[in-house]
């Protein structure tokens, strides 16, 4: 093989990739916020709701400083995969009850999938550990009632909002280290 002719820049630099990942995360955070408002408006919640199958919040904003790029991206990917699974479950299980939120829930699922793909690409470009996702969890049981499903929707959107808020802060901080 002879000397290289060189090649044009094929795709975004990882730092530019991180910028667009932050933008996409912010956009998804806003989508989630708006959807949460809609849900509360149509189905008022009585206090906070939890769902045992949801991931626990990765990190408090104050502890972000100590985090490393690999751990943030790996944890974020795992948590978002779980939320994607929960949104898919919610749409399947509550199709008729949440019909009024359906276009927005569908958009949320599509954007969540896109963000996961973006994170995956960023990890590949940086050659960070591609840890396998957690072993497949048992299928989520259908909600026991319509109200049970609505409580689950509150829990899913609330948890996703907190996770995305943490993600934006974490990614912005990591940008300074790349």
């Amino acid at each position: 093989p002879g000397p290289p002719p060189g090649s044009p820049r094929a795709s975004p630099d990882p730092r530019a990739e991180l910028d667009s990942t932050v933008l996409l995360t912010r956009s998804l955070l806003e989508d989630t916020r708006q959807l949460t408002i809609q849900l509360k408006d149509k189905f008022p919640a009585d206090g906070d709701h939890n769902l045992d199958s949801l991931p626990t919040l990765a990190m408090s904003a104050g502890a972000l400083g100590a985090l490393q790029l690999p751990s943030v991206l790996t944890r974020l990917r795992a948590d978002l995969l779980s939320y994607l699974r929960h949104v898919q479950w919610l749409r399947r299980a509550m199709g008729s009850s949440l019909k009024t939120l359906e276009p927005e829930l569908g958009t949320l699922q599509t954007r969540l999938d896109r963000l996961l793909r973006r994170l995956q690409l960023l990890m590949s470009r940086l050659a960070l550990p591609q840890l396998p996702p957690d072993p497949p969890a048992p299928p989520l049981a259908p909600p026991s009632s319509t109200w049970g499903g609505i409580r689950a929707a509150h829990a899913i959107l609330g948890g996703l909002h907190l996770t995305l808020d943490w993600a934006v802060r974490g990614l912005l901080l990591l940008k300074t280290r790349l």
């Epitope: 795709s11 690999p70 995969l81 470009r125 940086l126 050659a127 591609q130």
Partner: antibody, heavy 114, light 111 residues
Framework: EVQLLESGGGLVQPGGSLRLSCAAS????????GHWVRQAPGKGLEWVAV????????YYADSVKGRFTISRDNSKNTLYLQMNSLRAEDTAVYYC???????WGQGTLVTVSS | QSVLTQPPSASGTPGQRVTISCSGS?????????VHWYQQLPGTAPKLLIY???ERPSGVPDRFSGSKSGTSASLAISGLRSEDEADYYC???????????FGGGTKLTVL
């Protein structure tokens, strides 16, 4: 323009050692993972080793584990592959690559023969 | 034997559409990992053709497209041209090997 230029290939006897280098230019090398991929004559691509953007993570194909070492010097924009205990089956064109890999060098030929 | 399985050869006439498949497993393509495609023209280094299943790097014609479903992926080339004659490789990360893996490659002949 992005360039990756490999050097250090050549003829070596079985059991011998070689060190390949790859000089990167035209992009922010320190923001990309670095790979070595090889291609035996008339065969397909085989991934050899990868190192993370900052050098903290390294992975190797089973066929080279314990014999090859990947490293990088971001201050010199250079990727390295130290190859020890070389075998005839290591004969191949060795490509240096960066990112997904997004960018590839033109390759350097390593021949292991007595 | 490659971890990702591709047909060894494919062919088509100029203007035709050809598809090259890449079959994996739950530890690579099926594990939410992206598939990338490379083109290797005779006597040259591989070049990134498709990344993240379906994204085209700048400079790659839109005749080339990629898709992924389950544990398989495919590369489609429409409006086949003589200069497309090359070897095509798919690649993905593999959990069980803790590293990227390539398909065995598909030699595309333009008749």
């Amino acid at each position: 323009e992005v360039q990756l230029l490999e050097s250090g290939g050549g003829l070596v006897q079985p059991g011998g050692s070689l060190r390949l280098s790859c000089a990167a230019s035209g992009f922010t090398f320190s923001s990309y993972g670095g790979h070595w991929v090889r291609q035996a004559p008339g065969k397909g691509l085989e991934w050899v080793a990868v190192i993370s953007y900052d050098g903290s993570y390294k992975y190797y194909a089973d066929s080279v584990k314990g014999r090859f070492t990947i490293s990088r010097d971001n201050s010199k924009n250079t990727l390295y592959l130290q190859m020890n205990s070389l075998r005839a089956e290591d004969t191949a064109v060795y490509y240096c690559a960066a990112g997904v890999p997004d960018y590839w060098g033109q390759g350097t030929l390593v021949t292991v023969s007595s | 034997q490659s971890v990702l399985t591709q047909p060894p050869s494919a062919s088509g006439t100029p203007g035709q559409r050809v598809t090259i498949s890449c079959s994996g497993s739950s530890s690579n393509i099926g594990s939410y990992y992206d598939v990338h495609w490379y083109q290797q023209l005779p006597g040259t280094a591989p070049k990134l053709l498709i990344y993240s299943n379906e994204e085209r790097p700048s400079g790659v014609p839109d005749r080339f497209s990629g898709s992924k479903s389950g544990t398989s992926a495919s590369l489609a080339i429409s409006g086949l041209r003589s200069e497309d004659e090359a070897d095509y490789y798919c690649a993905a990360w593999d959990d069980s090997l803790s590293g990227p893996v390539f398909g065995g490659g598909t030699k595309l002949t333009v008749l």
